[in-house]
């Protein structure tokens, strides 16, 4: 069975959009009007992995770029990064675990838990124009809830 993917944008629960900040980083900020075109379009691929009640394993690539969000240890801390891959080989059904996120979707709110580091989530800061990061707390100051907007292929 081939990998199924959809194209989408993500906004955090404060309606901040995600944009590129340099070649290997995303940041979250409020966009309006024509500036909305700056937001990154993700290719969300549905991959094989551990399924539980409301968790669906996905990989988050940047559409038409050979970049995927991945989770690695840096200075002993789980860290979110954009990783370059060989476009001939990605996406694939059996993505390496660092690329896999458990998408948790409840009432149109999404969370993305790292498969590599359980209980660490894709997060944004309350503050404007700050990097998207991997956070180890839910329900605190940092934002872990997102909404997804479908983008036609």
């Amino acid at each position: 069975a081939p990998v199924r993917s959809l194209n989408c944008t993500l906004r955090d629960s404060q309606q901040k959009s995600l944009v590129m900040s340099g070649p290997y980083e995303l940041k979250a900020l409020h966009l309006q009007g024509q500036d909305m075109e700056q937001q990154v379009v993700f290719s969300m691929s549905f991959v094989q992995g551990e399924e539980s009640n409301d968790k669906i394993p996905v990989a988050l690539g940047l559409k038409e770029k050979n970049l995927y969000l991945s989770c690695v240890l840096k200075d002993d801390k789980p860290t979110l990064q954009l990783e370059s891959v060989d476009p001939k080989n990605y996406p694939k059904k059996k993505m390496e675990k660092r690329f896999v996120f458990n998408k948790i979707e409840i009432n149109n709110k999404l969370e993305f838990e790292s498969a590599q580091f359980p209980n660490w989530y894709i997060s944004t800061s309350q503050a404007e124009n700050m990097p998207v990061f991997l956070g180890g707390t839910k329900g605190g100051q940092d934002i872990t809830d997102f909404t997804m907007q479908f983008v036609s292929s």
Partner: antibody
């Protein structure tokens, strides 16, 4: 937690159309990536995959039975349906529905036994 | 379609034995293979996916190996609750199952 339950007639006559219902809880078929399959098993025999429906209403069918099968869903009522036309005694089996984001099946219903006999 | 040929079709063993069940795909399926356990009157239970990844909650005495066309399910030390029928399944193409291996108490 995730539960699935199949229902349908216990007995149908040859040439009739069989309609099965899978009622589930603990997940939503509006969740992107989610899917439900129908799988059957004649008594004492192997499992046979029949059809799969995805959250976006994309459908897949077993090539050998495709012409007789229709899978559909009612997302709001958490149900998936399978119809099999022109049934035959060889369609006698326990019919299972199973949840899968991929095609390995982590969650199954208890199964419903359907006999096809005149 | 891809056939999954499972062997043996039945197997007698004792508690504590190490048991291997094999499955051969009619064409290359990479590691797109799952293994299930089924007890009489019950639905199958997923044990392993991706040929070798243990499903959450499954005891570590179960293991899977293989890629391409040849796959093995191993139970390292049989427990009384392990006597059941086991099925392999490929999902490289539309899903197909093996004919099953009935594991019985010797």
């Amino acid at each position: 937690q995730v539960t699935l339950k199949e229902s349908g007639p216990a007995l149908v006559k040859p040439t009739q159309t069989l309609t099965l219902t899978c009622t589930f809880s603990g997940f939503s078929l509006s969740t992107s990536g989610m899917g439900v399959s129908w799988i059957r098993q004649p008594s004492g025999k192997a499992l046979e995959w029949l059809a799969h429906i995805y959250w976006d209403d994309d459908k897949r069918y077993s090539p050998s039975l495709k012409s007789r099968l229709t899978i559909s869903k009612d997302t709001s009522s958490n149900q998936v349906f399978l119809t099999i036309t022109n049934v035959d005694p060889v369609d006698t089996a326990t019919y299972y529905c199973a949840r899968s984001a991929y095609y390995s099946f982590a969650y199954w219903g208890q199964g419903t036994l359907v006999s096809v006999s005149a | 379609d891809i056939q999954m040929t499972q062997s043996p079709s039945s197997l007698s063993a004792s508690v504590g034995d190490r048991v291997r069940i094999t499955c051969r795909a009619s064409q290359d399926v990479d590691t797109d293979v799952a293994w299930y356990q089924q007890k009489p009157g019950k639905a199958p239970k997923l044990l392993i996916y991706w040929a070798s990844t243990l499903q959450s909650g499954v005891p570590s005495r179960f293991s899977g190996s293989g890629s391409g066309t040849d796959f093995t399910l191993t139970i390292s030390s049989l427990q009384p609750e392990d006597f059941a029928t086991y099925y392999c399944q490929q999902y490289s193409s539309y899903p197909t199952f093996g004919a099953g291996t009935k594991l019985e108490l010797k």
